[in-house]
Amino acid sequence: SDKLYQRKEPVISSVHTKVKGIAEVTENVTEGGVTKLGHSIFDTADYTFPLQGNSFFVMTNYVKSEGQVQTLCPEYPRRGAQCSSDRRCKKGWMDPQSKGIQTGRCVPYDKTRKTCEVSAWCPTEEEKEAPRPALLRSAENFTVLIKNNIHFPGHNYTTRNILPTMNGSCTFHKTWDPQCSIFRLGDIFQEAGENFTEVAVQGGIMGIEIYWDCNLDSWSHHCRPRYSFRRLDDKNMDESFVPGYNFRYAKYYKENNVEKRTLIKAFGIRFDILVFGTGGKF
Amino acid sequence: SDKLYQRKEPVISSVHTKVKGIAEVTENVTEGGVTKLGHSIFDTADYTFPLQGNSFFVMTNYVKSEGQVQTLCPEYPRRGAQCSSDRRCKKGWMDPQSKGIQTGRCVPYDKTRKTCEVSAWCPTEEEKEAPRPALLRSAENFTVLIKNNIHFPGHNYTTRNILPTMNGSCTFHKTWDPQCSIFRLGDIFQEAGENFTEVAVQGGIMGIEIYWDCNLDSWSHHCRPRYSFRRLDDKNMDESFVPGYNFRYAKYYKENNVEKRTLIKAFGIRFDILVFGTGGKF
Amino acid sequence: SDKLYQRKEPVISSVHTKVKGIAEVTENVTEGGVTKLGHSIFDTADYTFPLQGNSFFVMTNYVKSEGQVQTLCPEYPRRGAQCSSDRRCKKGWMDPQSKGIQTGRCVPYDKTRKTCEVSAWCPTEEEKEAPRPALLRSAENFTVLIKNNIHFPGHNYTTRNILPTMNGSCTFHKTWDPQCSIFRLGDIFQEAGENFTEVAVQGGIMGIEIYWDCNLDSWSHHCRPRYSFRRLDDKNMDESFVPGYNFRYAKYYKENNVEKRTLIKAFGIRFDILVFGTGGKF
């Protein structure tokens, strides 16, 4: 509340997050031409990355391109990329949509289609849809512990969201436990009016807002956080602006003295913790 | 503009970036004592890292130290590091400039020079200049899409820099398209009065400032971002304060049951997206 | 100091850090059933990670689980996890404390204890204490160079903490050299009234506050940073809220056609650089 007589000061904040949970992933795996059901367990070291402070990322889906090697190959035949003769292919050309540099030759991609040959990590990534339902859809049941230390330097006041009286086996609930700082990911989405199962396919960005409205006067002291949640990415975004949230990373290795990589396109939820508020004192 | 009757509130911001582009890298590669011209393609998974929010990094140059193993070896003979007898070498000493711990012995580095033996990742990193021109100098033509979601919680107002009417194939231009949020890296440097080709050698830090000056009164509503660019690292910095921008990281592997690593000293541009501004309402 | 006639503006800040130092680590290593003393050198690429801006992390301790593979195994017999018959084990159950999914069978963990069999990365991580003293306790002598560029856009004023007159071989000292921006990690802890050796075991979060109180009026211009230090994690935190600072990450590889990983639980100090302050001008 606005107390005009008070000296207001913005909050200085530090955040530490800890995600817990394991996911069971079942997918079709092809080895030596044989496709069989693959089953694996993902724990925190597999689906999240050591990130700093105000953000954490949980992988909910992925597409793998295994055993890529630097060589020449036909580019992926996405819309408008097919060719019938070398005239259509321009040596040295880098199409922003493509993953390589054209050699100038038009070569067979498969029995029916031809595309421009490129120098690239080959075979080039197939532009296939993210798996639906999402492979790590069970991430909905993961929990995150959020620790937030705040400081008003001008008032020489420091506090944190976790008090000694709190119970480490609680789960945040807007009504029943609004001060608990352990959040179930599915609940965050529900509070924000979003469908976790749906967002998990393409990924997205979710904001966890922590609002500190602190009255630091001794006679009416109050300084506790209020949590709220809102989706930060635009779910109605045009394809050309890359909807959802994903990034590519690679695992490199050597086989028969040739450098290879497995390319992973990781879709997931990036959670941004947005801390704001003021401390007021007479 | 300052409207003194308005209640001003600082912006709460979330940023998402997506870099696009491929680079063709040609460099001398030595294998089995034979030096030949190596040619490779770098895509986003090779030159950028999954980073959070307000920063992204594009590698523009690198120096590799391949096949390092934990053992004893002569340290690199940089200025003042040579020795003629064991007296010059102090067992257990860690020179901050060196990469290992001295054993106390003075040993031959090559046919003409001797240096103190160290326990380290060997052979120790050669202190050679970053390649000039930069290996990924073509990163100048990469583009970055910046998505920025902003919120004024006190005014319960949210918006973003990308509007539904925008065209996903645009490129930012200060005059012709100042609202487009797809930026060519070379253009960012040009706007900031900097030379990309030059900075790419040693690396640097570039600020992309997004200024929101929002009038939220319904009768004169305005809330769109203004982009500006400025270099954040000090190009005139003394050697001792580590000019440019680089960091080292390692790829670990096993060979004949011995743990080895390839050390990469990555030079590049870190782009910091600095979002600021206020929302005012009567 | 508060000059009421001035127009105040919050600082816009960009930070770049560079850690220096090497650590000698001695630990027991078991190979082929034989335990012997292992000795290794850690340099920046081994103990720190390429992180963005306002945070950097220094690993001070670790626990490794080597050669894990996705299979079935008995879960770790932590308190309350033992079983005597299959009735105690529930097929498909994921205990939040466990690292896998139960198969429903109760199997021998060792000669004396039985636990529920799980599908997991096996053998499952042993829940053992972090080594004491910390393996990289010598990180106390590492140094960090902090470069801070600040901007008051409304006043069109930019400066940085490192001036051309500064000496790159200085070390920060509150009294003798309060403007030097090279900090010994142990000194930061001492200034904050904390014991580095103790915190290094479990990890922690340390704040480096940079306060800019800038008077930008030409007749009494002053704009230099003031550094202060305070611990941000709660050292008295209950076990259930995960005291200290650690995260798990994995190194993946293939052996005998099976994907394996080495899981590293990294304990360390996350340093948060908190820049705040205002620029005032008539």
């Epitope: - | - | 299979t71 079935l72 394996k260």
Partner: nanobody
Framework: EVQLVESGGGLVQAGGSLRLSCAAS????????MAWYRQGPGKQRELVAD???????NYADSVNGRFTISRDNVRNTVYLQMNGLKPEDTAVYYC??????????????WGQGTQVTVSS
């Protein structure tokens, strides 16, 4: 139907060597622990050696240093290389494996056994 099929047993002189192999066949999801047990005349069945899917090995004290267990994860086969054989190694050697038929459906399987006889 999942089966474990052993081979490689036989008669050998003391100090000699043999290599046993055992292949899992049929339709299943994953082979986990594989092992060799033996049962000498008038004795109980005892563990000789086992090997996890991650190639961690464990040996009975009586064979440590003489026998080597290994596996091939492509062929779902386990091997036992037996060197420096002694008369007391005479037994029927049984292959054992924990095999998941489907996800979270482990079963323990035994081979029929193969006779190893060491003459002095």
């Amino acid at each position: 139907e999942v089966q474990l099929v052993e081979s490689g047993g036989g008669l050998v002189q003391a100090g000699g060597s043999l290599r046993l192999s055992c292949a899992a066949s049929g339709s299943f999801f994953r082979v986990n622990v594989m092992a060799w047990y033996r049962q000498g005349p008038g004795k109980q069945r005892e563990l000789v050696a086992d090997i996890t899917r991650g190639d961690r090995t464990n040996y009975a004290d009586s064979v440590n240093g003489r026998f080597t267990i290994s596996r091939d994860n492509v062929r779902n086969t386990v091997y036992l290389q037996m060197n420096g054989l002694k008369p007391e190694d005479t037994a029927v050697y049984y292959c054992y494996a924990t095999i998941e038929l489907g996800v979270l459906e482990p079963r323990d399987y035994w081979g029929q056994g193969t006779q190893v006889t060491v003459s002095s």
